[in-house]
């Protein structure tokens, strides 16, 4: 019961996390204009991974996509890549984990197979979460660097009498959404991995030799595929499959898969 709850909760947490990663990736407010030096601006600038926007005094917002690949900073491309990899891995992880859920029965799928799928999806969620956190952190670092560079530029040159104040950018809402979403996906993945341990059969199942001692006579019965000493209660010599060997029916096919301003 606890295993099912842990697995289900892990799935739900990961689902929320991946939805958040997708939302963050699509959001325009990765960086927003810093209003510290100009709190009365009638023109508010903000930028996302895919386009930059300007909200004017009329309330009208104009967004322009980055219609070039080669003209974009390498860091921005890297962040895009990390977020997309995170989304793809998370989506595959969700697909795998749906089939792995203990509460869902699909044919005669063994718990061991579900355990493997749970572990696979858990690892995918962990990597997905790490990708999102890394992507957001790289972007945040880029912002911090640019912020202090533009601050330095503001007070140098032309004797400090610069007419055009360079627009500085600070953290946008998407960064916080991304961090939280990445963290949730990571936590969900860890929960799935924990659930996997509980899903795997508790007792060691032996499928090798079973010895029946009656006085001095020993009955030898071959069973399974590997020779090992059997001390279990498998007195009727039923073959127990633990995932090491599967019939053809048991083999599962796992889902696998502008101008920069």
């Amino acid at each position: 019961m606890a295993v099912t709850a842990c697995q289900g909760l892990g799935f739900v947490v990961s689902l929320i996390g991946i939805a958040g990663i997708i939302a963050a990736t699509c959001m325009d407010q990765w960086s927003t204009q810093d209003l510290y030096n100009n709190p009365v601006t009638a023109v508010f600038n903000y930028q996302g991974l895919w386009r930059s926007c300007v909200r004017e005094s009329s309330g009208f917002t104009e967004c322009r996509g980055y219609f070039t690949l080669l003209g974009l900073p390498a860091m921005l491309q890297a962040v895009r890549a990390l977020m997309i990899v995170g989304i793809v891995l998370g989506a595959i992880g969700l697909l795998v984990s749906i089939f792995a859920l203990k509460c869902i029965r699909i044919g005669s799928m063994e718990d061991s197979a579900k355990a493997n799928m749970t572990l696979t999806s858990g690892i995918m969620f962990i990597v997905s979460g790490l990708c999102a956190i890394a992507g957001v952190s790289v972007f945040a670092n880029m912002l911090v660097t640019n912020f202090w560079m533009s601050t330095a530029n503001m007070y140098t040159g032309m004797g400090g009498m610069v007419q055009t104040v360079q627009t500085r950018y600070t953290f946008g809402a998407a960064l916080f959404v991304g961090w939280v979403a990445g963290g949730l996906t990571l936590i969900g993945g860890v929960m799935m991995c924990i659930a996997c341990r509980g899903l795997a059969p508790e007792e060691t199942n032996y499928k090798a030799v079973s010895y029946h001692a009656s006085g001095h006579s020993v009955a030898y019965k071959p069973g399974g595929f590997k020779a090992s000493t059997g001390f279990g209660s498998n007195t009727k010599n039923k073959k127990i499959y633990d995932g090491g060997a599967r019939t053809e029916d048991e083999v599962q096919s796992y889902p696998s898969k502008h101008d920069y301003v």
Epitope: N38, A42, V43, S52, V54, T164, Q166, T167
Partner: antibody, heavy 115, light 113 residues
């Protein structure tokens, strides 16, 4: 087409308040800010502030901040500008304006403050 | 506050001639976010509300004749009427659309010589 229709002329005594309305049509009322501009007789234009019907936010010119209140009623697509503690120098035509670059203006409301 | 200074205060130009009105702001109206200048030009005739001519310093509003053009960047801007028509007699205002409070120039009265 986009239209801003303002309420009629008002005559007020000093110290009183006046509330001018601006009814919008032809566009999504909550998408654009409604700005208010004052023009005293024979004078130039003076921005008073704006109301954002979408979120109720507003921004006032400090010159009017303590006396002006801008509100909106999205159900009837109408913006209001209330000016309190009227003085003789508040005698002016008050315009509401909206759209990109203030593309659309109301016809103006003459407010006369006289004892 | 950004102070908008228009020159001249009044201007008399012959029909068909070029009219030029200048506007200077005390601070730059250039937005580095989209590389645009946030200056607006209006035309106002007696008893009427102002009419938008140019926004973002050089973008003509729809329906505005192409004899009207705006130019300039940073702090210095110009409205040009390439060939003055009788209906162009009006007061012209420039406006800072970059920083609150939004401020207007004092106006330039354009007349026919």
């Amino acid at each position: 087409q986009v239209q801003l229709v303002q309420s009629g002329a008002e005559v007020k005594k000093p110290g009183a308040s006046v509330k001018v309305s601006c009814k919008a049509s032809g566009f999504t009322f909550t998408s654009y800010n409604i700005h208010w501009v004052k023009q005293a007789p024979g004078q130039g234009l003076e921005w008073m502030g704006y109301i954002s019907p979408g979120n109720g936010g507003s921004n006032y010119n400090l010159k009017f901040k303590d006396r002006v209140t801008m509100t909106s009623d999205t159900s009837i697509s109408t913006a209001y500008m209330e000016l309190s503690r009227l003085r003789s120098d508040d005698t002016a035509v008050y315009f509401c304006a909206t759209g990109r670059g203030f593309a659309y203006w109301g016809q103006g409301t003459l407010v006369t403050v006289s004892s | 506050d950004i102070v908008m200074t228009q020159s001249p205060d009044s201007l008399a130009v012959s029909l068909g001639e070029r009219a030029t009105i200048n506007c200077k702001s005390s601070q730059s109206l250039f937005n580095s976010g989209n590389q645009k200048n946030y200056l607006i030009w209006y035309q106002q005739k007696p008893g009427q509300p102002p009419k938008l001519l140019i926004y973002r310093a050089s973008t003509r509003d729809s329906g505005v004749p192409d004899r009207f053009s705006g130019s300039g960047s940073g702090t210095d801007f110009t409205l040009t009427i390439s060939s003055l028509q009788a209906e162009d007699v009006a007061v012209y205002y420039c406006q800072n659309d970059y920083s609150y409070p939004l401020t207007f120039g004092g106006g330039t009265k354009l007349e026919i010589k």
